[in-house]
């Protein structure tokens, strides 16, 4: 008789693929527009992305350190009117996009909590969950909790409020902290809490301590969903060089949990690059022409318009990776296992039941090396082949599709493989 | 049981004032939002604001911002609507309506459980 089929988890639209966070509606747009009328003609583009969710915003009135005029049920009008928004939240959910409201209360001041008036903002926020439910958001973000005092007891509260309305309802926060025993602590209380932090931006781009990370982080955590990303809020290209954006966006997408990326991520927009242009918000450069400021700074390679066209770009590695992760269910919600592969090397196994299953190789090096796959770390259930077929590289020049016998490895400097093979019982 | 009386309401000149107050008895409303609609003779029944529970956050139609405030005593069981500035086209018949579910009423009238008879406000230019 055939195995029993393993009984499929229980999977929440946020587990199905990646996030994508809109801190900057005016960045985002470019050329003086930035606004929601404006954003609901960019969801084409988030649908081809293949993302679930849009983190959007804050986009509520907020006049710098004032309490009085911060009002998280008013948009702020530069942004657009509450028609707008509504507008918006019904075309998102024709095209299967979640949104995600960030409701951060001071996001223009110094203290993004009002440190003198928590328990003001933290009421004002409990209602502003409420009103905005019921206008039909998917869930919320609230950034830089660190500065929340008593954070663990009101997000309890908030999410006790976004759960009791639906149990498909998401609550989100960000924190700047890498610190594992705290982002542990702040997790603890909240059991369906979606945390993003700084916990991997400091990975010292090596194997090894990437490896070390996450296999920490995955066991500290036990069974609990994750989610993924370098930061609470900005650009891979704040912590990465050019050379590891790829191989992070094979690693993000294939690591049990949720992806969150911040816009331009997928094409690696550098502020670094564009002079004048504010770290954590610069302009997304949809063609040659959204950064005028510096006649010739932007190639069409560094553009969306550029790379669409380019089968070999970054743009191009995120879509193909995005559509894998959201239809595969060894990448869905498979097992983990991460294995020794020899030094500079990542690797593991994401497997489900008799599903095909995926072997991931990252080598975080500058130099090109021989992987050693010790199948010796991996128990029974996550035994590997001699050969597994190539999905796909980071780097071109492979033939994808061909078999690749995993004794004799080699991966080029900061190449990242993605492998399939089936299941054998 | 939630059992909702307006009273307040009246005939004024345009660019005048009025305060609306709504009594609400058989139970405390301190744990709901609660929400001011009004309805003019042959249209729909439209929103004007909601207060949360607190009194802490008020949301008002594009309409009557900065001319109308919502408050609530909830020791006394009541809700306020101080109209200023009234224009003719703010005539209408005003309700007050509870929304034992939520802390924070909505727009959509449908949220709320509970409904007074209404108080007439005539605005005359």
């Known amino acids: 008789r055939a195995p029993r089929c393993r009984e499929l988890p229980a999977q929440k639209w946020w587990h199905t693929g990646a996030l994508y966070r809109i801190g900057d509606l005016q960045a985002f747009q470019g050329h003086g527009a930035g606004n929601l009328a404006g954003l609901k003609g960019r969801l084409d583009y988030l649908s081809s992305l293949k993302v679930k969710g849009l983190v959007l915003g804050p986009i509520h009135k907020n006049q710098k350190d004032d309490v009085a005029q911060t009002d998280l049920l008013q948009i702020d009008p530069n942004f657009g009117s509450k028609e707008d928004f509504d507008s918006l939240l019904q075309s998102a959910k024709k095209k299967s996009i979640r949104v995600i409201l960030d409701l951060t209360p001071n996001y223009r001041g110094e203290n993004s909590w009002f440190s003198t008036q928590v328990d003001t903002v933290a009421t004002k926020v409990k209602d502003a969950l409420e009103f905005w439910l019921q206008a039909g958001v998917d869930g919320f973000q609230v950034r830089d909790i660190e500065n929340l005092k008593d954070a663990s007891s009101f997000l309890a509260e908030w999410q006790n409020i976004t759960k009791g309305f639906s149990e498909d309802r998401l609550l989100i926060a960000g924190t700047n902290s890498s610190d594992l025993q705290q982002i542990l602590s702040l997790l603890e209380s909240n059991k369906d809490l979606l945390l993003t932090s700084s916990y991997l931006s400091d990975s010292g781009s090596t194997g090894e301590h990437t490896k070390s990370l996450v296999t920490q982080y995955l066991n500290a955590t036990g069974n609990r969903w994750c989610s993924w990303s370098l930061s609470q809020a900005r650009l891979l290209t704040s912590f990465l060089p050019a050379q590891l954006l790829r191989l992070y966006q094979l690693m993000l997408f294939t690591l049990p949990g949720t992806p969150v990326f911040s816009y331009g991520d997928e094409i690696g927009l550098d502020a670094a690059a564009l002079p004048g242009q504010p770290m954590e918000a610069p302009v997304m450069l949809w063609d040659e022409s959204s950064f005028p400021d510096i006649p010739g700074a932007v190639s069409a390679n560094m553009t969306v318009k550029g790379q669409s066209e380019d089968p070999g770009s970054l743009l191009s590695l995120f879509r193909r990776l995005s559509d894998q992760r959201s239809k595969e269910r060894s990448l869905l919600h498979g097992d983990f296992h991460a294995f020794s592969a020899g030094p500079g090397l990542f690797s593991y196994i994401r497997h489900w039941d008799q599903n095909e299953r995926f072997l991931v190789v990252l080598n975080f090096g500058d130099v090109g090396l021989s992987a050693g796959l010790q199948a010796s770390d991996l128990p029974a259930s996550a035994s590997l082949p001699a050969k597994a077929d190539l999905l796909l590289s980071t780097q071109p020049g492979r033939e994808e599709g061909s078999p690749l016998e995993l004794e004799r490895l080699k991966l080029e400097p900061h190449e990242g493989l993605l492998l399939r093979f089936p299941y054998a019982a | 049981q939630v059992h909702l009386v307006e009273s307040g309401g009246g005939l004024v000149q345009a660019g005048g004032s009025l305060r609306l107050s709504c009594a609400a008895s058989?139970?405390?409303?301190?744990?709901?939002?609660m929400g001011w609609f009004r309805q003019a003779p042959g249209k729909e029944r439209e929103f004007v604001g909601t207060?949360?529970?607190?009194?802490?956050?008020?949301y008002y139609t594009d309409s009557v911002k900065g001319r109308f405030t919502i408050s609530r005593d909830n020791a006394k069981n009541t809700v306020y609507l101080e109209m200023n500035s009234l224009k003719p086209e703010d005539t209408a018949v005003y309700f007050c309506?509870?929304?034992?579910?939520?802390?924070?009423?909505?727009?959509?009238?449908?949220?709320?459980?509970?409904w007074g008879q209404g108080t007439q406000v005539t605005v005359s230019s």
């Open positions: 207060i949360s529970c607190s009194g802490t956050s008020t």
């Open positions: 058989g139970r405390t409303i301190s744990t709901y939002g």
């Open positions: 309506a509870a929304d034992t579910r939520h802390c924070m009423g909505y727009t959509k009238h449908g949220g709320y459980d509970y």
